[in-house]
Interface confidence: medium
């Protein structure tokens, strides 16, 4: 029988009445155009909704926008358009919400052609009040908040000026001209690239990388011949043009650009690209595009300095055309990532790693599913997940895979079961153990979201017809109840719940269409009465993550340690609550060769855990350029995997000697760096 329809499914008592009492409808007095929704702060219940409507006139486009505010998680909305003087807001800039719980909001207004600069509306009290500010420039990008201080903003102008505000947009100063890209780093540092000659495009590969640590009082050139740069974790990356040809290489710095090392990665040509797929303070996943328009490349994982890289996955799908990759960090379990590969026959297959890119495997076939037409052997196949690439190809996939850090082990995704991703209508699958095992959860495509840290999963069928039914599960997707939230079906456009999956409220957005008009409408459902009581100790059970063989001493060991979690029992219908904190008990593992990656000059032959010397380097001194100095490496070929906490066990020896010789890549050495002050 289909999931949720077997006898074992216990029904939640009186849920219709409970949900009916907690369903709130709001009809927006708007013609249907576009709608955008932003949450302001964490656990504040404040939502801002911006509706915009364009009327194309003969000579120009007439635009109208409205701003609404809720402070009860979307149950009621108040029209606050008058707070922004009924001004038309530019949706391409969205609503710039401040970091953490700063309560700051910046809206960028549309201004008439001849004006000297743009206009913004600023709020620092969770959108209760707004201040209008006229800008001395026309913004090209959304205002960017400093992660450390929400009063510091930066923006690029349409004339490529870099503008900074130190008082939350009240006063602006142009700190540099001819800027292509600017990003906040740590400690209120700004990194940016500049062009010298014509433009960003013309100077690509000849840009300079600059840094200011005092909001534009003084500057330091930290890189030349730059193609582009990126920040990931504690790493600063720059792709740099080679001296002799049109190839470029990645350089990496861990000290804000004071010193650089050349990453041990392949160089790329004009048509290729590098991409930081994921980064944390320990390591980085880097995609290196293959030559030619292949649509794939190679994933490499770094060491703790971002310098030495190990090949992680071949034929990694990353289209050059649309720039789509399926690479997904499964946030509900440490070390787990999912992505797609393009196989030799051009079919797309899903791969998963449980150890941060050390090994990749296919996803296990769900117990309750048959292999589809793509499978050569009807008894042996895998689950393949639909993600960004499928969505970009307009397949019937309404949502990317979903996981939440506080809903431990849960992953929800659309997929098909066979030898490769199928273009047929997908079903929804769930894993409750971080991707090791999967079950078909819902037939056909759905929108889905996680509430109450996994205590409730909500889903709505993806349909071209109007809908009025929502499905919910209190047992991690095993059994489903359906609730009719309105008599009059609506054209569904999206599900909205507060980021972080701690809320028990869900908003269903859509529009109603009548003979003459269509209007935006939202239904907010509060599930608090479904989960009547707070969870107690007896509602939780101990779960060992990454457990594959309980009889193995090393069972559950990933990156040198194992973790036991307290997980809500599937049979418990209770509230984790907004203050729920994941309870975990870590335990260190013994070191084995699996806890080490191969050092510079070494590689792992396939299906072998030992690192062996690269033939071309055999017998040579291992000397390499690090931080602008020549280093001599004495190694038996191993370096601990970043973030690995193992102790005892195998302990390969490693030593690096400074040869006290200067060396530079073609990039720059500290002597070449210059500083200047404004």
């Amino acid at each position: 029988s289909a999931p949720g329809e077997d006898e074992e499914c216990g029904r939640v008592r009186d849920f219709v009445a409970k949900l009916a009492n907690n369903t709130h409808q709001h009809v927006f007095d708007d013609l249907r155009g576009s709608v955008s929704l932003s949450w302001v702060g964490d656990s504040t219940g404040v939502i801002l909704v911006l509706t915009t409507f364009h009327v194309p006139l003969v000579i120009m486009t007439f635009g109208q926008s409205k701003l609404y505010r809720s402070e009860d998680y979307g149950k009621n909305f108040k029209d606050i358009t008058d707070l922004i003087n009924n001004t038309f807001i530019r949706t391409e800039f969205g609503m710039a919400i401040g970091p953490e719980n700063s309560g700051k909001v910046v809206l960028t207004a549309e201004v008439s052609g001849g004006s000297r600069g743009g206009r913004i509306f600023r709020s620092s009290d969770f959108a209760k009040n707004f201040v209008q500010t006229d800008l001395p420039f026309h913004p090209l990008t959304q205002m960017m908040y400093s992660p450390q201080n929400s009063d510091y903003l930066l923006a690029l102008s349409t004339e490529n000026g870099l503008w900074v505000s130190k008082n939350f947009g009240g006063k602006w100063e142009e700190i540099h001209k001819a800027v292509c890209l600017a990003k906040w780093g740590s400690d209120n540092t700004i990194f940016f690239t500049t062009y010298a000659n014509g433009s960003c495009k013309a100077d690509l590969g000849a840009l300079e990388l600059w840094r200011t640590s005092d909001l534009g009082k003084s500057f330091k050139t930290i890189g030349v011949k730059i193609y582009s740069f990126g920040l990931g974790g504690r790493f600063l990356f720059a792709s740099v043009m080679a001296d002799k040809d049109t190839t470029r290489r990645i350089h990496v710095s861990t000290d804000q650009g004071d010193t650089w090392s050349m990453a041990q990665l392949p160089s790329v040509g004009q048509e290729q690209f590098y991409s930081i797929l994921a980064a944390n303070d320990d390591m980085v996943f880097m995609h290196v595009d293959e030559p030619g328009d292949t649509g794939f490349g190679t994933i490499f994982t770094s060491d703790d300095r971002g310098i030495v890289y190990s090949k992680s996955l071949d034929r990694h799908l990353y289209t050059t055309t649309g720039g789509e990759t399926d690479f997904t960090n499964v946030t509900s379990l440490r070390g787990v990532y999912i992505t797609s590969v393009l196989s030799e026959d051009n079919s797309i297959q899903t791969m998963i790693t449980f150890d941060q890119g050390g090994r990749w495997t296919h996803l296990r076939k769900p117990e309750n599913s048959e292999c589809d037409a793509t499978a050569k052997n009807k008894n042996e196949c895998s689950l393949h997940i639909h993600a960004s690439y499928s969505i970009s190809q307009k397949l019937n996939v309404p949502m990317a895979p979903l996981s939440e850090p506080n809903a431990v082990g849960i992953v929800i995704a659309h997929g098909s079961v066979g030898d490769a991703i199928s273009v047929m209508v997908p079903d929804v699958y769930i894993s409750d153990d971080g991707g090791y095992s999967w079950t078909k959860m819902l037939e056909g495509p759905h929108y889905y979201t996680i509430l109450d840290s996994g205590g409730i999963i909500v889903a709505i069928e993806h349909s071209s017809r109007p809908i009025n039914v929502i499905k919910f599960s209190t047992d991690e997707g095993q059994c489903w109840q359906t609730y009719t939230f309105t008599r009059d079906p609506i054209y569904f456009t999206g599900l909205a719940s507060e980021p972080g999956a701690r809320s028990m409220n869900i908003s269903i957005w859509g529009f109603t269409e009548s003979f003459l008009t269509s209007q935006w409408v939202s239904y907010t459902i509060d599930f608090k009465d479904i989960l009547e009581r707070n969870c107690e100790e007896k509602d939780y059970t101990i779960w060992l993550a990454h457990s594959t063989d309980p009889e193995d001493y090393e069972d559950g060991c990933i990156l040198g340690y194992k973790e036991q979690f307290l997980r809500l029992r599937k049979s418990s219908v209770c509230q984790n609550g907004r203050d729920y904190v994941v309870t975990k008990q870590p335990s260190i593992c013994l070191c084995s060769l699996e806890d080490f990656l191969c050092d510079f000059g070494y590689y792992r032959p396939e299906n072998d855990s030992k690192c062996v010397e690269q033939p071309e380097l055999k017998g040579h001194d291992l000397e390499f350029c690090l931080y602008g100095r020549e280093e001599h490496l004495t190694t038996n070929g191993y370096r601990k995997i970043p973030g690995d906490k193992c102790q005892g066990g195998v302990n390969p020896v490693r030593e690096v000697k400074d040869l006290k010789k200067k060396c530079t890549s073609n990039f720059l050495s500290p002597e070449k760096q210059n500083s200047k002050s404004n």
């Epitope: 309980p550 001493y553 090393e554 335990s587 260190i588 084995s592 005892g648 066990g649």
Partner: antibody, heavy 124, light 107 residues
Framework: QVQLVQSGAEVKKPGASVKVSCKAS????????MHWVRQAPGQGLEWMGW????????SYAQKFQGRVTMTRDTSISTAYMELSRLRSDDTAVYYC?????????????????WGQGTTVTVSS | DIQMTQSPSSLSASVGDRVTITCRAS??????LNWYQQKPGKAPKLLIY???SLQSGVPSRFSGSGSGTDFTLTISSLQPEDFATYYC?????????FGGGTKVEIK
């Protein structure tokens, strides 16, 4: 109950090898490390190494490297320690000991269950 | 290798006495220290692991303390069955090393 039963006493000549067995019962053999520790007459305890029965990986003390081999047979839940090129100062009681399994952060290699010991005498 | 030095190497005490044995590591071993009791002709028995955690089944009169390089085993009230040799053991780094032992005799 959990116990480790070792093979009987051995008398060997210098230069020979000895293989001591240790049969585990009352717990899952592969889920715990097995250490080997020896004690010369009237002396203290000396750690020789461990074997991880689940994968067969080993870690030996430098002093015994090249002379000791630790193996296991999971089908009969038995660990073995073989010491070659015996000398008279290898005369000792040899113990196998189960490694305590950490319940939280790494707690080091405690040994919570010990075999009764096997006396090995090396004499010409 | 990390050297473990136990003191005293032997001591005489009476039933009911409070007994303290110390163990010093040649370098810091955090709290990765275990204590064992061994009676003549018998295998050692784990008393304390991770410097201060009491192994299940061991009487509460035994306690351990310390971290870094200096550790202590205390028997709050010596019982007749406690006369034995006590060993400390570090398990921070390979190779595992034991102290020389402390023999507790009847006064």
């Amino acid at each position: 109950q959990v116990q480790l039963v070792q093979s009987g006493a051995e008398v060997k000549k210098p230069g020979a090898s000895v293989k001591v067995s240790c049969k585990a019962s009352g717990y899952t053999f592969t889920a715990y490390l097995m250490h080997w520790v020896r004690q010369a007459p009237g002396q203290g305890l000396e750690w020789m190494g461990w074997i991880n029965p689940s994968g067969g990986s080993t870690s030996y003390a430098q002093k015994f490297q090249g002379r000791v081999t630790m193996t296991r047979d999971t089908s009969i839940s038995t660990a073995y320690m073989e010491l070659s090129r015996l000398r008279s100062d290898d005369t000792a009681v040899y113990y196998c000991a189960r490694g305590k399994r950490s319940s939280g952060w790494y707690e080091g290699y405690g040994m919570d269950v010990w075999g009764q010991g096997t006396t090995v005498t090396v004499s010409s | 290798d990390i050297q473990m030095t136990q003191s005293p190497s032997s001591l005489s005490a009476s039933v009911g006495d409070r007994v303290t044995i110390t163990c010093r590591a040649s370098q810091s071993i955090s709290s990765y220290l275990n204590w064992y009791q061994q009676k003549p002709g018998k295998a050692p028995k784990l008393l304390i692991y991770a410097a201060s955690s009491l192994q299940s089944g061991v009487p509460s009169r035994f306690s351990g303390s310390g971290s870094g390089t200096d550790f202590t085993l205390t028997i709050s009230s010596l019982q007749p069955e406690d006369f034995a040799t006590y060993y400390c053991q570090q398990s921070d780094v390979s190779p595992i090393t034991f102290g020389g032992g402390t023999k507790v005799e009847i006064k």
